[in-house]
Every structure is written in C-alpha cells, then in structure tokens.
Interface confidence: low
C-alpha cells in the first residue's frame, strides 16, 4: 500500500490522542531502556509502512499484536485517513484472523511494540535519515 | 503566518567567510527540519545540507562538508549557515527551507552572496 | 547518489497549451517526488509533492503522475502566470538532488 496518500495530521491526532496511552498501557513494567530501537524510517509514508509491517505482520516469537488495542486502534485510523486502504487489507484480515487464536504477551512481544513506539515518535516529528 | 526571513546582499573577498541568517515565526521551530540550497547565476539548484534545530544535528553533502558550518539559535528561532574559503564559484543565491517530509513548504526570500576580488 | 534527469531543459508554449515535463530518477525512488516553480529573482515555490499531491493553493490546472522512475508534471491549459522554470526533486532521503529545470518561454 502506498501510503503518500493519508492525511498525516488525522493520523497523527489519532495517536496522540489514544493510540500513545495504548501503547503505554502495553508496555507497563518494561523499562524504557530495555530495549534498542532498530526499526527506523524517514519520512511519515515510510514511517507507517514499517508501523503497519510491525503492527500486522506475524514474527517469529510475536504473532499476538493484531488483537491489542493499539493494533485495532491503529488499523481503524489507517482506514479511515488512508484511501483505499481497507480495501487492500481485505486479505491480510482473514489471515489474521486464522494465526491469532489468543493474546500472549512475549518478550518478543514487547521488543516489538517498544520499536513501534520509536516508530510513531518518528512518524510525529520524521528524522529524514536516508532509507 | 509561516516566514523564513534571511539577511541581505554580502559581498566578499575570496578566502573570507559569510554567515547566512535565517528567521523562522508562525511555526514551531523545532518541528522542522532547516535545509539549505544555492542557486548559482543561470544555474539550477543545488541541495547543501541541512540542520535539525531540535538538536542540532547536521547533514552536509560532500563538497562542503570542510567549508560549511550550520547552526541555530532556538531562543531567536533562527538558523544560520557559514561558509568559508570563499571562492568565485561560491557565488549564489542561498536559501534556507524548511521540510518535515522533504519536500519544502516555505523558503527564505534567498541571500545573494558575491565572491570578488 | 540519486541523479534526477529533467527534459526538456526548455520549451516553448502559448497560452491553452497543455504543457507535459519530465523527471527521471536514477533508482527507485517510490513516490517521493517534488515539483517547483519558481520565476525570476524569486524563490522556488512548491506545487507538488509525493509525486501528485498538489500543494496548498496550487490551482488544479497543475498534476503530478507517477510510472515507475519517471514522473511527470502536467499544466492541463498553460496561464500567462505560469511562463517560468520548473524543477523536480526526490525527497527520499539523503542527499536530496535537483533536476537540471524546466525553462517554460513564451512562443
């Protein structure tokens, strides 16, 4: 999906607004400092296109996200301020909806969101770093 | 209103030094990157670098990385840029820009800079 | 480094005209695409960015398109206002590059 086309600013209230406390609710009890953000991008089309890969996409070790409530919150907010996004989610959803039986909180887990949380602040005010 | 307002017309010897200001208001300063571009006479334009007033942190292309020092002074919101060892070539137009995504909303009215002897 | 390559370097046109300029970048560089104008002793402004979005108070006679590594800049029916130089530039991360301009003359 080509994400040059959302409304970054809607976006971007959506996270401030929610999706940041979320995120915050999920990580509780983990240190800020525990883990090293390795997953940057540069630019606010570039920084969703990892946030989606990290919210949506199985890992090996994390395959629980889609169901927490940053990852709906997220998805909602990608559906509406992204056109045609939904659309080209359609598939990805009945994947999902067969891998996530449970929500299990990993350390993987954890790792994960602690990048998507150096992903969204990226997002907010971009770094411009070369891809 | 966004504004980037440069300072004026420098003429300079070949060898000196000019200093580039660059004033930001109607915006948070911080939030934007500040990128710097010449123009040199008939020519197109040419990317310099640029500076993340949050931090300080730089980016120079580089041809200029030894001849080009850029700064801001957060309390005044303003950027500069100093280049050194003035040459012929050195001759332009200097703008500043400022970008979040890359591309550049707003430009300073540009600062002519003439390197002669 | 990623080269943009602009053509024509000038052309000439008369006012209705539909006005097509070109931009090719050396590598892949999605859609992170700007468009410029700038006239005499001004400074450049912007009327497109990620490739075909138009700026802000950009009138709609200005389009932006994407194939691949060309990009194109589409003035659907030229203005008096519009005779002045163009020039394109990827904004996908550093160094950002130019292309060479557009010089749009009056025939």
């Known amino acids: 999906y080509d994400f040059t086309n959302c409304d970054f600013e809607k976006i971007k209230a959506a996270y401030l607004s929610t999706i940041s406390k979320d995120l915050i609710t999920y990580m509780s009890g983990t240190k800020s400092t525990e883990f090293n953000n390795t997953v940057s991008c540069s630019n606010r089309p570039h920084c969703l296109t990892e946030i989606q890969s990290l919210t949506f996409n199985p890992t090996a070790g994390c395959a629980s996200l889609a169901k927490e409530m940053f990852a709906m919150k997220t998805k909602a907010a990608l559906a509406i301020w992204c056109p045609g996004y939904s659309e080209t989610q359609i598939n990805a959803t009945q994947a999902m909806k067969k891998a996530r039986k449970s929500k299990v909180t990993t350390n993987k887990c954890l790792e994960q969101v602690s990048q998507l949380q150096g992903l969204w602040r990226r997002f907010n005010r971009p770094l411009l770093k070369q891809q | 209103e966004v504004q980037l307002v440069q300072s004026g017309a420098e003429v300079k010897k070949p060898g000196a030094s000019v200093k580039v200001s660059c004033k930001a208001s109607g915006y948070t300063f911080t939030t934007y990157w500040m990128h710097w571009v010449r123009q040199a006479p008939g020519q197109g334009l040419e990317w310099m670098g640029m500076i993340d007033p949050s931090d300080s942190e730089t980016t120079l292309i580089q041809k200029f990385k030894d001849r080009v020092t850029l700064t801001v002074d957060k309390s005044t919101s303003t950027a500069y840029m100093e280049l050194s060892s003035l040459r012929s070539e050195d001759t332009a137009v200097y703008y500043c820009?400022?970008?979040?995504?890359?591309?550049?909303?707003?430009w300073g009215q540009g600062t002519t800079v003439t390197v002669s002897s | 480094d990623i080269q943009m390559t602009q053509s024509p370097s000038s052309l000439s046109a008369s006012v209705g005209d539909r006005v097509t300029i070109t931009c090719r970048a050396s590598e892949n560089i999605y859609s992170y695409l700007a468009w410029y104008q700038q006239k005499p002793g001004k400074s450049p402004q912007l009327l497109v960015y990620f490739a075909k979005t138009l700026a802000e108070g950009v009138p709609s006679r200005f389009s932006g398109s994407v194939s691949g590594t060309q990009f194109t800049l589409t003035i659907s029916s030229l203005q008096p206002e519009d005779f002045a130089t163009y020039y394109c530039?990827?904004?996908?991360?550093?160094?950002?590059?130019f292309g060479g301009g557009t010089k749009v003359e009056i025939k």
């Open positions: 820009a400022r970008t979040l995504d890359g591309y550049y909303d707003y």
């Open positions: 530039q990827h904004h996908y991360g550093t160094p950002w590059t």
